[in-house]
């Protein structure tokens, strides 16, 4: 006869481990008892249980409630046991010793491998700002046994680097993703992907990139100068910019206060029916936490009753200031 067993038994942390030990013998052979032991290179041998054909299962008190026989039906030649709720400390070598009649004794060893699935965590890097050089976007850490694989899934161009720390019963892997921030990356997903034999599928954590920027400001509304005539209603100037965080807008007049009736509504400056009083230099101020920008335009309101007054061009200028 011979013992049927496994070289390696793999189980996920918290699951029950079946330690197999089946005696394959002649029909007239009997198994009298099966002894199970843990074999540790440092501690030596620790008896786990004795499975006796007459007296049943006897378990080392240190393993009480953790070692059981598999559920029925059970073959009398099957000396397998269940180790309930496997923990990392259970990992190691196990031995079954089978006493048979009349063939004598047999023994076999197997290794129990306890997989500890990782629980990954993603930590965003410092705030990203357009204009920075290579910057840490995020780091992702996962600890498990064996060491997990940590990679990144993203359309964003960047570099990834990994390092691992080995602990007595596990390994922690940290991967960092670096990039050169640009506004095109705003809102793009950066996904940490953790693979491990103890996971049925990869674990994924997604971080949405936010890159602080502020675009140049410009003013729209003066494209057709002929519209800016005395008496015209609904004339507006709109300040154009974009940024992250979204910018705030403010309007001022360079050569004095805003004329009566001129209303500021966010990025838009609304005029009442135009008069020559509305002529002047208007400044749009755009700002967010990163920077501020200005754009100024000269408005000349034409009086049809005064054809001698001509304006060839509306002038505009742009300025910006970084916080």
């Amino acid at each position: 006869g011979e013992l049927e067993t496994s070289d390696v038994v793999t189980v996920v942390l918290g699951q029950d481990a079946k330690l197999p030990c089946f005696y394959r013998g002649d029909p007239d052979e009997q198994v009298g008892q099966v002894a199970w032991a843990r074999v540790d290179p440092n501690e030596g041998i620790r008896e786990l249980a004795l499975l006796h054909s007459k007296y049943g299962l006897h378990v080392n008190p240190a393993y009480e409630d953790r070692v059981e026989q598999p559920p029925p039906p059970r073959d009398p030649l099957d000396g397998s046991v269940l180790l309930r709720n496997a923990v990392q400390a259970d990992e190691g070598e196990y031995e079954c010793r089978v006493s048979t009649f009349p063939a004598g004794s047999f023994q076999a060893r197997m290794r129990l491998r306890v997989l500890v699935p990782p629980l990954p965590s993603l930590n965003p890097g410092p705030p990203l700002e357009e204009g920075q050089g290579l910057t840490l976007a995020a780091s992702c850490t996962a600890e498990g046994s064996p060491a997990p694989s940590v990679t990144w899934d993203t359309e964003v161009k960047g570099t990834q680097s990994s390092r691992s720390f080995t602990h007595p019963r596990s390994a922690a892997v940290t991967s960092e993703f670096h990039l050169v921030p640009s506004r095109s990356m705003n809102g793009q997903p950066l996904t940490c992907v953790v693979s491990h034999p103890g996971l049925l599928q990869d674990r994924r954590i997604t971080h949405t990139l936010q890159v602080a920027f502020l675009a140049e400001a410009s003013v729209r509304g003066l494209e057709d100068q002929n519209l800016w005539q005395v008496g015209r209603e609904g004339a507006t100037l709109k300040c154009l910019s974009e940024g992250q965080p979204p910018p705030k807008y403010n309007w001022t007049r360079l050569d004095g206060p805003l004329p009566s009736g001129v209303r500021v509504k966010g990025d838009t400056l609304g005029f009442p029916p135009l008069t020559t009083e509305h002529s002047g230099v208007y400044v749009c101020h755009v700002s967010n936490e990163l920077s501020s920008r200005d754009s100024q335009v000269t408005v000349e309101v034409l009086d049809p009753e005064d054809p001698g007054k001509q304006v060839d061009l509306v002038s505009a200028s742009h300025h910006h200031h970084h916080h």
Epitope: G32, I45, E47, L50, P61, E95, Q107
Partner: antibody, heavy 121, light 107 residues
């Protein structure tokens, strides 16, 4: 300090029964198996069986099956071995011995002082 | 049942001598072999378990070796308190069985 204290010597008639006690102290009684080993005068050691004090489960050597019963009373941390249908060749010193933590069913790390049972008509 | 055979049955030695006792199992018992010391009128005392592991509190002059079927207990330098009877015992399977003992006497 671990101690196993056994009951005193007994003289019994053939065919009668004897019950030997073993009181444990200095450790958690239910955390270790208790074995019984006997030694006839001038002879070697002979294993009789064990009891798991926690569950009450037993395992007896085939030689003693049907004649021996091992029990325990966890409230007083005491194990008992009763041997029935005594014969003159049962005259021996009977020891209780604690199974070790690592080798619960096969290594005896502490022993009682022994109880001499004499079977004589 | 596994039969354990010790040799010699008895030996005479002097204080300071190196003493070796052998134990043979009727079948392979791996390293499931233990040694006990017994003095007259006293209970046995565990010396060595798992063939070579020294029980806590036992002097280091005692050592055990062997695997499979052949095992040895060695006392490197015999002391006056070591004169006693020594038993081997297998814990490979039940019934647990002992050797017949080796009596170490003063020469």
């Amino acid at each position: 300090e671990v101690q196993l204290v056994q009951s005193g010597a007994e003289v019994k008639k053939p065919g009668s029964s004897v019950k030997v006690s073993c009181k444990a102290s200095g450790y958690t009684f239910t955390g270790y198996y208790m074995h019984w080993v006997r030694q006839a005068p001038g002879q070697g050691l002979e294993w009789m069986g064990w009891i798991n004090p926690n569950s009450g489960g037993t395992n007896y050597a085939q030689k003693f099956q049907g004649r021996v019963t091992m029990t325990r009373d966890t409230s007083i941390s005491t194990a008992y071995m009763e041997l029935r249908s005594l014969r003159s060749d049962d005259t021996a010193v009977y020891y209780c011995a604690r199974g070790s933590a690592l080798h619960f069913f096969g290594v005896f790390d502490y022993w009682g002082q022994g109880t001499l049972v004499t079977v004589s008509s | 049942d596994i039969v354990m055979t010790q040799s010699p049955s008895s030996l005479s030695a002097s204080v300071g001598d190196r003493v070796t006792i052998t134990c043979r199992a009727s079948q392979s018992i791996s390293s499931y072999l233990n040694w006990y010391q017994q003095k007259p009128g006293k209970a046995p005392k565990l010396l060595i378990y798992a063939a070579s592991s020294l029980q806590s509190g036992v002097p280091s002059r005692f050592s055990g070796s062997g695997s499979g079927t052949d095992f040895t207990l060695t006392i490197s330098s015999l002391q006056p308190e070591d004169f006693a009877t020594y038993y081997c015992q297998q814990s490979y399977s039940t019934p647990l069985t002992f050797g017949q003992g080796t009596k170490v006497e003063i020469k």
